[in-house]
């Protein structure tokens, strides 16, 4: 759930890495209220996820490794 470019709350679903093409990080500041990882899916959706959750960290780690290899 997002308002303009800000995530307002986190998804309550778990996504598979095969569904995700990339991510961006949202930092809490004067524009956005919460820290979030925004996953970009193969369907063109942006999904707001909690950066503290293990499943989110795993995908971020996996995607970061891929990027570093390139």
């Amino acid at each position: 759930a997002s308002n303009f470019d800000c995530c307002l709350r986190y998804t309550d679903r778990i996504l598979h890495p095969k569904f995700i093409v990339g991510f961006t990080q949202q930092l809490a500041n004067e524009t956005c209220d919460i820290n979030a990882v925004v996953f970009h899916t193969k369907k063109g959706l942006s999904v707001c996820a909690n950066p503290k959750q293990t499943w989110v960290k795993l995908i971020v780690r996996r995607l970061s490794k891929k990027i570093n290899k390139m």
């Epitope: 598979h16 095969k18 569904f19 795993l58």
Partner: antibody
Amino acid sequence: QVQLVQSGAEVKKPGASVKVSCKASGYTFTNYWMHWVRQAPGQGLEWMGVIDPSDSYTTYAQKFQGRVTMTVDTSTSTVYMELSSLRSEDTAVYYCARGNYGVDYAMDYWGQGTLVTVSS
Amino acid sequence: DIQMTQSPSSLSASVGDRVTITCGASENIYGALNWYQRKPGKAPKLLIYGATNLADGVPSRFSGSGSGRDYTLTISSLQPEDFATYYCQNVLITPYTFGQGTKLEIK
């Protein structure tokens, strides 16, 4: 070796609650999710939800939202599934299953199952 | 939620037969699909993960294929111990829905 040992069979009255336990051994408990899946008589497998023992994050199937609670006790490597407001349709065998993101998020080890009978 | 549809729902075959079970998803699940075997009175057993990968200890007569919305489980030469019910499962996104099952019976 990996083992998931569940609590024994339960008989409950409609409206009551049941709490099923699943004790894990043979692996690092907090490194794997734990799913709960049930099978009612003559029916197929039904995914109920999952808990991540490392942070207690849970997500439940919509059908069970508000009736199911999954909890974890890391000191004993045990996961619990409590289902409330039981009805006759909840009569089923309930399984815990280890979720392994290393093998494509599959459920690679299963408990022996716990039969829950709901009857007045 | 993603719906999974298996066919056939039941199947009669003989020892030595080649058997194919299909599973269709209501949308593209990008290969995030697992197959399980369940025998009466026993817990399900993982057979195939990631649509095509054989789980540890599973005989090589089992194989999985498919992509997008359509997936297949094949048993190349049926053995007596293979008579059971088989389920596919979506793991692309929770809820992790199962197919309704395919019961494989002795002809």
